[in-house]
Amino acid sequence: SEVEYRAEVGQNAYLPCFYTPAAPGNLVPVCWGKGACPVFECGNVVLRTDERDVNYWTSRYWLNGDFRKGDVSLTIENVTLADSGIYCCRIQIPGIMNDEKFNLKLVIK
């Protein structure tokens, strides 16, 4: 089952997600999506990175940590009740079925 995280209406929510780059700066693509992780990629994408940078994001969603060191934790700004639900963090490690998938449940009070 999903790990549960809580935040209050109007505050920022923090959803942790980490990986260890094979070497400094040797990044892998990561996507964040609203909804449980599907078979591949992320549905309802709110943010994604490639091998170099954040290449897609939507308002209120950002990475506060140093994603170049593998901290791809998601911050959601000024949350509302509509932000409740499951979020997918997917670390897209190259290879055959190597992706790491994390489903995180956000509860807004």
Epitope: G35, A36, P38, V39, F40, C42, G43, N44, Q92, N98
Partner: antibody
Framework: QVQLVQSGAEVKKPGASVKVSCKAS????????MHWVRQAPGQGLEWMGI????????IYAQKFQGRVTMTRDTSTSTVYMELSSLRSEDTAVYYC????????????????WGQGTTVTVSS | EIVLTQSPGTLSLSPGERATLSCRAS???????LAWYQQKPGQAPRLLIY???SRATGIPDRFSGSGSGTDFTLTISRLEPEDFAVYYC?????????FGQGTRLEIK
Amino acid sequence: QVQLVQSGAEVKKPGASVKVSCKASGYTFTSYYMHWVRQAPGQGLEWMGIINPRGDSIIYAQKFQGRVTMTRDTSTSTVYMELSSLRSEDTAVYYCARDFYGSGNYYYGMDVWGQGTTVTVSS
Amino acid sequence: EIVLTQSPGTLSLSPGERATLSCRASQSVSSSYLAWYQQKPGQAPRLLIYGASSRATGIPDRFSGSGSGTDFTLTISRLEPEDFAVYYCQQYGSSPITFGQGTRLEIK
């Protein structure tokens, strides 16, 4: 226009392998995932797996793990599906199908299909 | 594995009538991850609906999709002669990707 052209029909003996190709044209090959789906005579659709044509991500259906290999050649915009240890139950039409997830679109759906390759397994 | 059960297996209707096809999932599927396809004899499937309710490019507006959770519906508001075919639902939510067994829509 966007199209997928597959290799021709194959007849194989049980225990043999078959390699089906799927050549893409009309779009940026490395921007879209490619599925392989098969359909036995008179039956429904069965998903076999998916490859990211950049070649860095492959997912196989558990049923086919160990027997299926999906590869790609970006120089010719072609994906391949090889199925080994063939048995009579593998007789089917094999389709490649592009998933339209990508290029800023984050929904899923197999929007372009090859014409299908008939593989017959018979002794 | 998520099992998709389509009903009815065969639907016999006349042109001009309304068709309602059902797809029930063995466990909840996000609506973002559900699609519908049409297949005619000797042809590859054609994407009709993605995200449970969005029409694919070039699909007439007589086709519509709805539903959430475990119950999804494809509706054809007024059947045209070219609509008689087999229809499949499909889910992307959990590996393996699965299809329903199909509903055959035939002319009455």
